[in-house]
Interface confidence: low
Amino acid sequence: MSSKYPRSVRRCLPLWALTLEAALILLFYFFTHYDASLEDQKGLVASYQVGQDLTVMAAIGLGFLTSSFRRHSWSSVAFNLFMLALGVQWAILLDGFLSQFPSGKVVITLFSIRLATMSALSVLISVDAVLGKVNLAQLVVMVLVEVTALGNLRMVISNIFNTDYHMNMMHIYVFAAYFGLSVAWCLPKPLPEGTEDKDQTATIPSLSAMLGALFLWMFWPSFNSALLRSPIERKNAVFNTYYAVAVSVVTAISGSSLAHPQGKISKTYVHSAVLAGGVAVGTSCHLIPSPWLAMVLGLVAGLISVGGAKYLPGCCNRVLGIPHSSIMGYNFSLLGLLGEIIYIVLLVLDTVGAGNGMIGFQVLLSIGELSLAIVIALMSGLLTGLLLNLKIWKAPHEAKYFDDQVFWKFPHLAVGF
């Protein structure tokens, strides 16, 4: 049987998405052009490779990481790709309008595509908290609002605090986590009787989620170093991220076993905890002076991630309606905060070392940045949540949460909806 979207959504989704795409094409037509200068070829290839790494992380890594639900794996992967494709287009335009537009045209470089992919990644992190409870039309709204909010946050931070691309993008972890959690808080929560099995994980989707985690694990150093300007900083970022994620894998697997009464390893813990180190060192990856420090951070992050995965899902499920396996939101919120705290500690030590007597001021600026990121994430998340609750989107009924058949055509299935 074919999927039975409600009639109005069947009409509304293609119309909404294609109208939006047409509008984006027009905006690109009138306002953008490619960088016409002759790039150094070696630099061009290297720059493209980093962008490619980010795309792999987004499409395969985050796409598959969120696909562990028994009856929602198709939607998780495909909706992620849809959001990435839409998010990158809007992010390129938005970043161009915010940073270059006074010159009349938005110049598209490989760097701007890289930046846009990272902005779109924010949506893919946030959406983990709501996937299965929303349809594509609602996800389009979420993409537009979140990319716009993150773009404006980055511009405000860049102008007020004079931080560079790397620093203002590294708030993405905290921003995406709090955005996703606040959207989830606004959506209908109870899972009616008879649907409990749908948000459980299954072996094959769990395997594909592990595949997603592996892709993210492999490419996380690229993510943390993508926007750094100095080759030395970039090298430090790659090394430190690599050490941190390596240690967080060992910690995740052993910590998961330790947390279980029979010493068994939880797939869900491992999916997210393997990435813990990368998130925790994100903000300060280019500043950590030696490997042991990155490794200690990876260890602490792995433990926090496993601890969070053990004790927080109950609370998140009750309060936010987030299923047990969607632990990316609170994981990133904790680890993002850890990363920001580490950054502030390093800042204090560094400023003391420089002897310029500006410690209080520097710390205040860092706390200001972090607070601003959290406040904008919560506010824009709540706004998005309220928008998604509007009747016009014809959200799936709670009884049809976490169900691919609501959205996909499965010719081999006799069961209709």
Partner: antibody, heavy 128, light 107 residues
């Protein structure tokens, strides 16, 4: 020792093009941002353009945007300035300069950028 | 774009005396300000970066100060070699505008 050697200046008619080169030696060229700065006769310094160490980002002064293109070839340790649609007001001594990063507080991005090494200058005269 | 304004455009100094040059930016630039010295017919030379950090090899009689939008360069115990034009330049955003310069002459 660290040095920047410029070439490519000369007299050119308005509306024509010219390409300036700046060959770097004595340092790892691919690790530094590079600038072009000009100085009209009897006038002050005017910043023209900057290119990041890897060529990924370029910025231009409003007065040259759309006409001048900064580029670099890291394999040849050379910086270029392609000047098209030249005007009389582009007449100046053009300097290439290396951008150094002065660490204030490593964290919080307190890196102060400054031009610490300059080329000898090359004169461009736009005249009919 | 950020504009830099220097004052005065020229000033006379007594050898052994002290002179103060000022530079003002049209927007907040924190401490992202550099000072350059240029002798007639010569290439500019970086004196101070980050508003107050003296470059290696620059005599300690040069001191930079200020932050935000107002900056100063003070030359104590002026020497004949200090007779030159001084430029301020911001490095706050992607652009790098210079001031129009202050020429220091000897009385």
């Amino acid at each position: 020792q660290v040095q920047l050697v410029q070439s490519g200046g000369g007299v050119v008619q308005p509306g024509r093009s010219l390409r300036l080169s700046c060959a770097a030696s004595g340092f790892t060229f691919s690790s530094y941002g590079m600038h072009w700065v000009r100085q009209a006769p009897g006038k002050g310094l005017e910043w023209v353009a900057v290119i990041w160490y890897d060529g990924s980002n370029k910025y231009y002064a409003d007065s040259v945007k759309g006409r001048f293109t900064i580029s670099r070839d890291n394999s040849k340790n050379t910086l270029y300035l392609q000047m098209n649609s030249l005007r009389a007001e582009d007449t100046a001594v053009y300097y290439c300069a290396r951008e150094t990063v002065v660490v204030a507080a490593k964290i919080r991005n307190h890196y102060y950028y400054a031009m610490d090494v300059w080329g000898q200058g090359t004169t461009v005269t736009v005249s009919s | 774009d950020i504009q830099m304004t220097q004052s005065p455009s020229s000033l006379s100094a007594s050898l052994g005396g002290t002179v103060t040059l000022t530079c003002r930016s049209s927007q907040f630039i924190s401490r992202y300000l550099n000072w350059y010295q240029q002798h007639p017919g010569k290439v500019p030379r970086l004196l101070i970066s980050g508003a107050s950090r003296l470059q290696r090899g620059v005599p300690s009689r040069f001191t930079g100060g200020g932050s935000g939008t107002d900056f100063t360069l003070t030359i104590k115990n002026v020497q004949p070699d200090d007779i030159a034009t001084y430029f301020c330049q911001h490095s706050y955003r992607s652009g790098r505008a210079f001031g129009q310069g202050t020429t220091v002459e000897v009385k």
